[in-house]
Each structure stands twice: as structure tokens, then as C-alpha cells.
């Protein structure tokens, strides 16, 4: 025998108190699939969260973070403070990257400069707290009598720091 609740579409719930009719989800609640026996309460984007997408009878609200913060976790479950480029967030707040490290974003951690010598290259542009070093041609390529000079490697695009 078919469950009468299976006929209840998204946006409704199967109301056992009312002979299993499909009642519309009350305001501030939703059901994203059919056959539900209850509607879920809409997420409220409060405080440091702000509403990116309003709740509806069939879908939950979606939040993002107010300016100066960024999302962390699935579905923006947390908001973390932004820092400036050249900084990382610690338990004591935003701290400048130590010498030899950089951060080119407002989030994430400071990462070590690229070691050009590991690739047999020289440092073309020094690193800063905000930017990685730029590696240039290998010293051998610049020695007298070299038949050709390899053009300097272009500065790489700022990458996304690991989360």
C-alpha cells in the first residue's frame, strides 16, 4: 500500500495531526524534498553572517560573511576574520609573516618563499611578506660564452593558499 505521505511535494509536509494531508511548510521553515513529515527551520544569517540567498518553502537560506570576514566550512558554517596580505591569523589576531614567508591573500597561512636554488635558478626578484620570490635564469645561463639566454620566468599568479 502506497504511503499517502509520498504524494506530498517539496514545500509541504505530511501532517499526521490532520489526516496526513500535505500542509504547506509554515513560514520560516522549508522542505527541499517530497514525502517529508516535518519542515526544517530556515537557517538565520545573524551577527557576522549575512544572507546570500533567502529561505523559501523549498530551500534553506544561504549565508556568507560580512565584510572583513570570510567563509570556512561546508555551507559557510563559520566566518573567520580577514587579515591583510602579508599577514596570517593566529590565536592572538593578525600577525605579520615571518621573514622568509609570504601570504598574498587575506586568508590562509604564511608560506615559505620558493627556494630558487633547488631548481638551479637564481633569485630575479626578492620576496616580500606579500609576494613570493621570482626565480630567474640559472647562474650557468648567465655565464660568459653561453650561446643563448633563457628568458626570465614570468612571475606566477598568486595561488590559493591551502585551507
Amino acid at each position: 500500500l502506497q504511503d499517502p505521505c509520498s504524494n506530498c511535494p517539496a514545500g509541504t509536509f505530511c501532517d499526521n495531526n490532520r489526516n496526513q494531508i500535505c500542509s504547506p511548510c509554515p513560514p520560516n521553515s522549508f522542505s527541499s524534498a517530497g514525502g517529508q513529515r516535518t519542515c526544517d527551520i530556515c537557517r538565520q544569517c545573524k551577527g557576522v553572517f549575512r544572507t546570500r540567498k533567502e529561505c523559501s518553502s523549498t530551500s534553506n537560506a544561504e549565508c556568507d560573511c560580512t565584510p572583513g570576514f570570510h567563509c570556512l566550512g561546508a555551507g559557510c558554517s563559520m566566518c573567520e576574520q580577514d587579515c591583510k596580505q602579508g599577514q596570517e591569523l593566529t590565536k592572538k589576531g593578525c600577525k605579520d609573516c615571518c621573514f622568509g614567508t609570504f601570504n598574498d591573500q587575506k586568508r590562509g597561512i604564511c608560506r615559505p618563499w620558493t627556494n630558487c636554488s633547488l631548481d638551479g635558478k637564481s633569485v630575479l626578484v626578492n620576496g616580500t611578506k606579500e609576494r613570493d620570490v621570482v626565480c630567474g635564469p640559472s647562474p650557468a645561463d648567465l655565464s660568459p660564452g653561453a650561446s643563448s639566454v633563457t628568458p626570465p620566468a614570468p612571475a606566477r599568479e598568486p595561488g590559493h593558499s591551502p585551507q
Epitope: 511535494p9 514545500g11 511548510c25
Partner: antibody
Framework: EVQLVESGGGLVQPGGSLRLSCAAS?????????PCWVRQAPGKCLEWIGC?????????YDANWTKGRFTISRDNSKNTVYLQMNSLRAEDTAVYYC?????????????WGQGTLVTVSS | DIQMTQSPSSLSASVGDRVTITCQAS??????LAWYQQKPGKAPKLLIY???TLASGVPSRFSGSGSGTDFTLTISSLQPEDFATYYC???????????FGCGTKVTVL
């Protein structure tokens, strides 16, 4: 412009039938909206007739007195809701309103048509 | 079935008066109640939903309260444009769940 426009009213003899239409413009019916029919006899109270789910399923909610005589249906491709009225009686004479019942307005009727007059008389 | 009983059925008042209209449901409807204003020859206009939330564009002199079975609409200071008929409606969906009260006509004293 966001509006509801009713049509199909007029004079009908007792025992006759009539189909009223309610065309929505400026928005589309969805699970957030339940189009409803409400009527008001001359000088009388508002009387709820029923509503239909705004999404793709044919779920209707009706006042018990309508059973067997009044049927609500919907054509989503035309963004239109209908009220089929059969076995009409003199006491069905009223202005018939189409209203949009909205989830974000606590299922209150946040948008109403201008109404269409149905007169049942011989 | 849910029945809605409104009182009084009519009242007379003057501009500036505080007006209170009550509505009683025959069973608990939580906060699922709407209030409407209707003027002669016009469609109803939503004033308040979810018992106490003011609809968009409605002046703040209108307020609603109540939950369960007993509800109130208050006009804090009656204005000339407020003379009209006011209806409550259960928005507790389901068959016979959306009944209206029979209205309160507010006229000039």
C-alpha cells in the same frame, strides 16, 4: 506589473456552470505561492473557497461546503488558475476574488485581483 | 473545521481614537492569522500576517497580537483613511483551514 486578473464572471441560470480564470502576471506560481479563491456575496462577509499548491503537484485545499460543486485547477504553462463552478444556486451570487497566498507573508493573501461578479438568477 | 469569530461586528470611533478588534479561533492555530482591511467596492488588503508581523507598506499605527485561539488587531490612533471593514483569517492550511471572520465595520462616530 505584478497582478492577478480574474475573468469569466457573468449571469448564469440556477443549475448552470461557469469557469472563472485568474491570470497571474509579473510573477510565476511556485511552491512559495498558493493561488486561492475567495468570494463575497453583496453586503456579506468574505468566504474562503480554496487554494491550490503553486508548484507542480495538484494538491488542493477546499472549504468543506464546496465539495462536488467547486473545483480548483491550474495551468502552469499559462500561469493561470481556474475555478470550475457547477450546480450553481442563487446563494452563489457574489464577487469572486483570486488571491495569492504567499509563504513569506505567513500564507496571508498579499496580492488580490479586482474580482469578477457572478450572478445566478433565472 | 476552523471557525473564526470576530467582535465587535461594528464600532463607531473618532479620528485619533485607539481601536481594538478581537478574533477568536475555534481551535489553536498557533500564530497563523492574517488581518485585512477592505473598503467598499475594493479587494481586501493584507495588513498583518503571522499574527503580529506588519505587511509591507502598512503604517505602524496598525499592530497585531495573540497566539493559539485569541488574537487582537489594534489601531493606535485612528486616521480618516482607516474607516473600513477589517477581517481576520486563519492561515492554518488544510481543508477548511483558511476561514475568515465575518468582519468588523469601523465607522465615523
Amino acid at each position: 506589473e505584478v497582478q492577478l486578473v480574474e475573468s469569466g464572471g457573468g449571469l448564469v441560470q440556477p443549475g448552470g456552470s461557469l469557469r472563472l480564470s485568474c491570470a497571474a502576471s509579473g510573477f510565476s506560481f511556485s511552491a512559495n505561492y498558493y493561488p486561492c479563491w475567495v468570494r463575497q456575496a453583496p453586503g456579506k462577509c468574505l468566504e474562503w473557497i480554496g487554494c491550490i499548491y503553486g508548484g507542480s503537484s495538484d494538491i488542493t485545499y477546499d472549504a468543506n461546503w464546496t465539495k462536488g460543486r467547486f473545483t480548483i485547477s491550474r495551468d502552469n504553462s499559462k500561469n493561470t488558475v481556474y475555478l470550475q463552478m457547477n450546480s450553481l444556486r442563487a446563494e452563489d451570487t457574489a464577487v469572486y476574488y483570486c488571491a495569492r497566498s504567499a509563504w513569506y507573508s505567513g500564507w496571508g493573501g498579499d496580492l488580490w485581483g479586482q474580482g469578477t461578479l457572478v450572478t445566478v438568477s433565472s | 473545521d476552523i471557525q473564526m469569530t470576530q467582535s465587535p461586528s461594528s464600532l463607531s470611533a473618532s479620528v485619533g481614537d485607539r481601536v481594538t478588534i478581537t478574533c477568536q479561533a475555534s481551535q489553536s492555530i498557533s500564530n497563523r492569522l492574517a488581518w485585512y482591511q477592505q473598503k467598499p467596492g475594493k479587494a481586501p488588503k493584507l495588513l498583518i500576517y503571522s499574527a503580529s508581523t506588519l505587511a509591507s507598506g502598512v503604517p505602524s499605527r496598525f499592530s497585531g497580537s495573540g497566539s493559539g485561539t485569541d488574537f487582537t488587531l489594534t489601531i493606535s490612533s485612528l486616521q480618516p483613511e482607516d474607516f473600513a471593514t477589517y477581517y481576520c483569517q486563519s492561515t492554518y492550511y488544510g481543508n477548511d483551514g483558511n476561514a475568515f471572520g465575518c468582519g468588523t465595520k469601523v465607522t465615523v462616530l
